[in-house]
């Protein structure tokens, strides 16, 4: 007991009334108004509870505190008086805050702030919507993925911030009268090949595809090492150069130098260089055959192999290169007598005649082109007098029937067994390399040295043997007529040709030798 008569055991939040009683402080209550035992407690009164008599008024909230309460303006409202708290309705001066005016950037980008009582909302601009996790933030609507499919199928949808575009797909263009961008855009495929919008290398041919294009190697060309064919970046090289290399097993410096020149010409070859390249190859061949050097020291059989390889390769190279020439007639001649005549045309339905110093060739144009080949038609004739040196003593292999016929009408082969080459060796080629069975025959008229009387004159071609060498043969070639210094031959295939004089002794006037003009 306190000497002043005040209880010292009063519970928390209470004050003593006298020495034996306590009373709860304002804002607290206990079970009974007067507390007489220390076991009782004073609990905070929640003045803000529903049944409470406290009224803060509109636009305000009641906040309970320990032993008291405060009235404060609700979020979005503020007191006109400036007093942050108040106790009853009569002190309430709360009014709506215009957040939109207070903070113009409240809705960030792409939204418009709209004030509401106690708050605000964000109204998104067209093409935007409120973000669910942040209702105050406007985010772009991706019209392209929203399932609306706003664009025509010939276009592709391009989402923009707040909008979208219907753009022509790569390789497409707006149809005449159509815009390129709005949702009414309609497109069509661009033919990049005919419009010149392609990036194909000059070693390739452009092929249009739907919405794109591809570049394919020209006929006779192959993709460069490691580069696939039929791509936009395909680059090709002429196969003719890469395959025309010295024949295996032949050791000749002169020949090696010739092939070095061929490879040098092929290294930086481009279609536009075809004319110069053809001339340079024939110039090199002409020089090789004029001065064969160590080729002349090779055994005869090896010389024949070299000749076979040169004739075969030359035909391929000239065929490949001439496809890149522009239309027209070309004639080249070289100091040692090598001569080239070439005609390049778009397919025409007529016969073609190529005239040279020592030979004339006549055939139908329609033989020249392989069906489906888009390139120009080429007919070519090369006279290679110098090849005679390498083909000296080359064997003649007759078909059994011809062999028998000759034995019947002639006494037989004389002691000097090898036939004599009367004419220049000529090589004929077409853009079409399938010339083993021509639908209509080719006619050659050879000018040549005088025929020794009573000797058999034969129209022959060079047959490339399996062994890479070869021999003269007559299969598919017939001698139409001959006189002292000219012979007419007709053949059903193309290759390298010549007129031979075989050492047969003619017993009587041979009707085959009668000239047919």
């Amino acid at each position: 007991q306190d000497s002043r008569g005040c209880a010292r055991w009063c519970p928390q939040d209470s004050s003593c009334v006298n020495a034996t009683a306590c009373r709860c402080n304002p804002g607290f209550s206990s079970f009974s108004e007067i507390i007489t035992t220390p076991m009782e407690t004073c609990d905070d009164i929640n003045e803000c509870a529903t049944l409470s008599k406290v009224s803060c008024g509109k636009f305000s909230d009641c906040w309970n505190t320990e032993g008291s309460y405060d009235c404060v303006c609700s979020p979005g409202y503020e007191p006109v008086s400036g007093a942050k708290t108040f106790k009853n309705e009569s002190e309430n001066t709360c009014q709506d805050v215009d957040e939109c005016q207070q903070n113009p950037r409240l809705c960030k980008s792409y939204g418009t702030c709209v004030n509401t009582l106690g708050s605000y909302t964000c109204q998104c601009l067209p093409g935007f919507k409120l973000k669910p996790e942040d209702p105050k933030l406007c985010t772009d609507v991706n019209e392209c993925t929203s399932g609306q499919n706003p664009c025509h199928s010939s276009t592709h949808c391009l989402n923009n911030v707040g909008s979208y575009q219907c753009r022509c797909r790569p390789g497409w263009q707006p149809i005449p009268g159509s815009p390129n961008g709005p949702n009414n855009t309609v497109c069509e495929d661009v033919d990049e090949c005919s419009s010149g919008q392609h990036q194909c290398d000059s070693s390739t041919v452009c092929f249009n595809t739907v919405g794109s294009y591809s570049c394919r190697c020209r006929p006779g060309w192959k993709p460069r090492h490691g580069i696939p064919n039929n791509q936009k970046d395909t680059v090709c090289e002429d196969m003719t150069f890469s395959t025309w290399t010295p024949p295996p097993g032949v050791h000749s410096q002169t020949l090696s130098r010739f092939f070095d020149k061929v490879q040098d010409l092929g290294r930086d070859y481009k279609p536009g260089l075809a004319n110069n390249t053809i001339q340079s190859i024939l110039q090199a061949l002409d020089e090789l055959l004029e001065a064969p050097g160590d080729l002349e020291t090779l055994p005869r059989l090896q010389q024949h192999c070299v000749a076979s390889h040169l004739l075969d390769g030359l035909e391929d190279v000239l065929r490949g290169l001439s496809k890149n020439l522009s239309n027209g007639l070309l004639n080249f001649s070289y100091p040692a007598g090598t001569e080239l005549s070439l005609e390049v045309q778009k397919q025409v339905d007529r016969s073609v005649t190529l005239r040279q110093n020592q030979a004339v060739m006549q055939l139908d144009w329609n033989q020249a082109q392989k069906s489906g080949d888009p390139g120009p038609s080429v007919v070519g004739l090369v006279s290679i007098p110098g090849m005679g040196k390498l083909l000296a003593e080359a064997p003649l292999v007759l078909e059994p029937e011809k062999q028998m016929l000759l034995h019947e009408t002639h006494q037989g082969l004389l002691q000097d067994g090898s036939p004599i080459l009367l004419s220049d060796v000529i090589s004929a080629f077409l853009s079409n390399n399938d010339t083993q069975n021509l639908s209509s025959p080719v006619t050659f008229t050879f000018s040549h040295r005088s025929v020794i009387p009573r000797q058999k004159v034969l129209c022959v071609f060079w047959e490339h043997g399996q062994n890479g060498c070869g021999h003269w043969a007559t299969t598919g070639c017939s001698t139409i007529g001959t006189r002292d210094t000219s012979t007419i031959c007709r053949c059903t295939h193309l290759s390298s040709f010549a007129v031979l004089m075989a050492h047969y002794d003619v017993q009587e006037e041979d009707p085959v030798l009668t000239v047919i003009t």
């Epitope: 070693s203 020149k261 040098d264 930086d268 481009k270 279609p271 536009g272 260089l273 340079s280 110039q283």
Partner: antibody, heavy 118, light 106 residues
Framework: QVQLQQSGAEVKKPGASVKVSCKAS????????MQWVRQAPGQGLEWMGA????????RHTQKFKGRVTMTRDTSTSTVYMELSSLRSEDTAVYYC???????????WGQGTLVTVSS | EIVLTQSPATLSLSPGERATLSCSAS?????MHWYQQKPGLAPRLLIY???KLASGIPDRFSGSGSGTDFTLTISRLEPEDFAVYYC?????????FGQGTKVEIK
Amino acid sequence: QVQLQQSGAEVKKPGASVKVSCKASGYTFTNYWMQWVRQAPGQGLEWMGAVYPGDGDTRHTQKFKGRVTMTRDTSTSTVYMELSSLRSEDTAVYYCARGFTAYGMDYWGQGTLVTVSS
Amino acid sequence: EIVLTQSPATLSLSPGERATLSCSASSSVSYMHWYQQKPGLAPRLLIYDTSKLASGIPDRFSGSGSGTDFTLTISRLEPEDFAVYYCQQWSSNPLTFGQGTKVEIK
């Protein structure tokens, strides 16, 4: 007749770039590679590279790799040689020349003097 | 790369004399060309493909050789022939020139 007309002399600072042009006339532009050759004062001829006008394909020496760009404009029959990151040793007369493997460089431009000086 | 070495570096001769210029290659060359250059002018093609005379070149100039050794010959030097001569190979990239031979008046 064949003519190769080059652009005029240039003075450049180190680190800058220079673009020399060469306009061809009198022949089929795509039938020859166009070569670029330079000659430093009192020195010999040095091949830089070449461009094929038909498709823009180029060849160049390792020495100039990454620094030289050779282009062509077929509509004007003009080729261009741009040399970047210039240094004083790039001071030279730059020539364009029409060339083919077997025929050599048979026609030359008059030359363009490029002086690189700070 | 193919290195071309020209010799001699300088050739002192009188008009009317014969000049023989050599060009040696570090490896075999198929296409060798020769050029003449006078001070302040662009080079001029003299001989192409080892031995062929370029258009407008007088026939006192001739070329020969094969493989790695090539020669340019001027049969009788004229006053206008005193100049620098370069050989150039076109057999492998990079194309290369010789360092030049100066033909001067003795």
